[in-house]
């Protein structure tokens, strides 16, 4: 009988203290003098001193009102001793249970709590979560059990009713319908925490449910109609900025404009983009207008928006009058650029050909020709008629001013508007190939050994162009052929130089006569340098000294 | 053994203020409560308080609600008492008691005299 | 408050007497009954606790009883040094007080 059953003591008691609590009792108090004393967290170690015994009778006493939310329970343990400090009883366990008094309120986790709803959701759509705590038990009491409510809406349109909350999850929902972020673009709710699920102390906070824009508003044109003025041929220009309102969230996806030409534009000369700022349509020419093909173009252009409507709308449609301005046209030359093939070399004054150039405008003006640029010199144009002739001699073989047969001219055609303007054309005259270049061997100076000689082979090189060319054929005049014998391969690109007798060592003029293909002959005289010496020599060794 | 030793004697004016205290060993201090007890020359005994050693919570008797203060320092095992206003009246033997509810151990007592 | 009368007020007794001092508490107080001796200039000492408790070291001559309103405290045999006031007190409700006191003198 040396037990006691758990004691539960009320937090927050009144006292008066020490309070009795039990009274621990040995049986063995019957035979001798007992002392009682008792060990233990809350009795001889921290926190110490909130329970005691009084030693002579056993009562168990508490010392100060508990707190169940810093402890809930205590373990103590119960000591029995005789007169002589003899243990007369083993360790008696005491458990001491503090139970709950509703002595808190609930505690929000946040004062403002915020959250966000996409406008024009049906009703039952979840919003947020919120969450208050209460240190009071929950488990074997309602005293921490929190129940949750809102106190009030503002503002209160379109109704004071357009959420709800769960009582016991805190989870905030959309019980109407009718949110619209236009109107009403956030709503503040006092929202209630009650401990006693719902019948105790009241605690209260703020949750600021912000509007999501949803993109149930079109963008409208203001105003619907424009009228612009272009001058013709300008590329990139600035037609017209147009403008548009949105109720949607500015700068959002459901704001942003896109703009969609959707007729007028049937030779696709305009383009719209939007301004990332003013998120104007900015239409512009994609190519230049014609005045005299078209003066005036109506276009019709449609605006939507970035994100696609949430539901159906009817979008809006502005139409722009465009006026296309005549300016006075630069002459163009037809074609631009004039490809003519003329033989060189012919005649001073001979025609080349006729480049002209067309006035877009209709107006009859009168066109004046000139050259812009000939590098060389060779050629002259009528500046009426546009008539190019010869007036130096065109040569496909001139290196500096011919690229691949290719002389290339500009001309310019000047027209009497007011003020004038001019156009260039580009003459590219292919010059034919006139076989007026003999063949001409290289090298032209050669040394060889006047005993053993090495056969001398000679590259032949013709500036005109096949069939003007190879195979060439080789000749020796002026008695040459007495000493050397020259001989073309078979390939006819190169001729052999060979010393058929003996010479001394001296310098030799060799005359060799080359001929193309076209009888084109030239006359070379090849510088010989004959040196005393066997087979292959580069320099003539000097005179041999005996010793 | 248990001892508690208390302050030496006090002659005050009315009007003052008289602070007792009372140093205790041979227990664990803050297990227990110190109670307060005058005796008036020729008069019998008179609880005025008593106060929890480890917490400081403290209980009065209502005669001297308002005008007693008691007060412990742990770090010293010393519990005081603080009568403030003294009139004539208030001239008795202060004694410290240690107990629960009964009283198992006394001071040697601390006379407080108040005179003009 | 608790009023707790003690009789008689003063005695006269012989060395070997049995002496009977009477408590009676205004209201209930259980056993929360206890009883000190004080001998002039000195402070009470403690007897009895919980009205029938001997505190150690107190002789068996000194003995207590009653519960509820009514307790009484017997010396068996009176010693000498048994010659004292000696006071009541409840500790059942605050404020705890005291009886008057009983002077026991030699006859």
């Known amino acids: 009988d040396w037990v006691v059953a758990p004691i539960s003591v009320p937090e927050n008691g009144k006292g008066p203290f020490p309070q009795r609590l039990n009274q621990l009792k040995s049986n063995k108090d019957r035979d001798t003098k007992i002392f009682y004393s008792i060990t233990g967290p809350g009795a001889d170690s921290p926190p110490e001193g909130v329970f005691a015994v009084e030693k002579e009778t056993g009562w168990l006493l508490l010392n100060k009102p508990l707190d169940r939310e810093e402890i809930a329970k205590y373990e103590l343990f119960g000591h029995a001793v005789s007169e002589n400090g003899a243990s007369v009883e083993d360790p008696m366990n005491i458990s001491i249970i503090v139970t709950d008094q509703n002595d808190h309120k609930p505690k929000f986790t946040q004062d403002t709590f915020r959250g966000s709803v996409l406008e024009g959701v049906l009703p039952g759509t979840s919003v947020m979560q919120v969450t208050a705590t209460d240190e009071d038990d929950a488990i074997y009491t309602y005293n921490g059990v929190v129940a949750y409510s809102i106190h009030s809406q503002e503002p209160k349109d379109p109704h004071d009713l357009m959420f709800t909350i769960h009582r016991s999850t805190g989870t905030i929902s959309v019980i109407s319908s009718g949110l619209d972020r236009e109107k009403v673009p956030e709503y503040t709710l006092t929202i209630q925490a009650t401990d006693m699920d719902g019948d105790g102390s009241t605690t209260t906070a703020v949750a600021v449910v912000e509007i999501l824009d949803a993109n149930d508003n079109a963008p409208m044109f203001d105003p619907q109609k424009y009228e612009a003025h272009v001058p013709e041929n300008a590329v990139g220009h600035e037609v017209q900025r147009l403008t548009v309102t949105d109720l949607d969230a500015p700068n959002s996806p459901a704001w942003r404009a896109t703009y969609l030409i959707m007729g007028g534009d049937d030779g696709d000369h305009f383009t719209i983009t939007t301004h990332p700022e003013s998120n104007q349509g900015i239409l512009t020419t994609r190519k230049g207008l014609d005045f005299e093909a078209k003066n005036q173009h109506t276009l019709y252009v449609e605006v939507t928006n970035e994100a696609p409507f949430v539901l159906k709308l009817p979008t809006s449609t502005a139409t722009i009058v465009v006026h296309v301005e005549d300016v006075n046209e630069a002459p163009v030359f037809v074609p631009p650029s004039k490809v003519v093939e003329v033989q060189e070399g012919i005649p001073t004054g001979e025609p080349v050909c006729v480049y002209t150039a067309e006035d877009p405008d209709k107006e009859n003006q009168k066109i004046s020709y000139r050259i812009l640029r000939d590098p060389a010199g060779w050629l002259a144009m009528d500046p009426d008629s546009g008539q190019v002739t010869a007036v130096g001699t065109l040569d496909r073989e001139d290196e500096q001013f011919v690229r691949n047969n290719i002389y290339e001219v500009m001309v310019l055609a000047m027209d009497n508007g007011s003020p004038p303007t001019t156009g260039t054309g580009t003459l590219l005259l292919t010059l034919i190939d006139v076989n007026d270049h003999g063949p001409v061997p290289e090298p032209r100076q050669i040394t060889i050994c006047n005993q053993s000689p090495v056969r001398q082979v000679l590259n032949i090189t013709d500036k005109d162009l096949s069939p003007h060319t190879s195979p060439f054929q080789a000749q020796l005049t002026d008695d040459s052929d007495i000493y050397w014998t020259a001989e073309v391969n078979e390939e006819g690109d190169t001729v052999v130089l060979s010393l058929k007798k003996f010479l001394k060592q001296d310098t030799y003029d060799v005359h060799l006569s080359l001929s193309d293909h076209g009888n084109k002959e030239q006359l070379t005289v090849i510088r010989a340098t004959v040196c005393d010496c066997h087979g292959h020599v580069e320099t003539c060794p000097g005179p041999w000294k005996g010793g | 053994q248990v001892q508690l030793v208390q302050s030496g004697a006090e002659v005050k004016k009315p009007g003052a203020s008289v602070k007792v205290s009372c140093k205790a060993s041979g227990f664990t201090f803050t297990s227990y409560w110190m109670h307060w007890v005058r005796q008036a020359p020729g008069q019998g005994l008179e609880w005025i308080g008593n106060?929890?050693?480890?917490?400081?919570?403290?209980n009065y008797a209502q005669k001297f609600q308002g005008r007693v203060t008691l007060t412990v320092d742990k770090s010293s095992s010393t519990a005081y008492m603080e009568l403030s206003s003294l009139r004539s009246e208030d001239t008795a033997v202060y004694y410290c008691?240690?107990?629960?509810?009964?009283?198992?151990?006394w001071g040697q007592g601390t006379l407080v005299t108040v005179s003009s | 408050d608790i009023q707790m009368t003690q009789s008689p007020s003063s005695l006269s007794a012989s060395v070997g007497d049995r002496v009977t001092i009477t408590c009676k508490a205004s209201?209930?107080?259980?056993?929360?009954v206890s009883w000190y001796q004080q001998k002039p200039g000195k402070a009470p000492k403690s007897l009895i606790y919980w009205a029938s408790n001997r505190f150690t070291g107190v002789p068996s001559r000194f003995s207590g009883s009653g519960s509820g309103t009514d307790f009484t405290l017997t010396i068996s045999s009176l010693q000498p040094e048994d010659f004292a006031t000696y006071f009541c007190e409840q500790y059942s409700s605050y404020p705890f007080t005291f009886g008057q006191g009983t002077k026991v003198e030699i006859k």
């Open positions: 106060i929890q050693l480890s917490y400081g919570n403290t």
């Open positions: 209201q209930n107080v259980d056993t929360d």
């Open positions: 008691a240690r107990g629960f509810s009964y009283f198992d151990y």
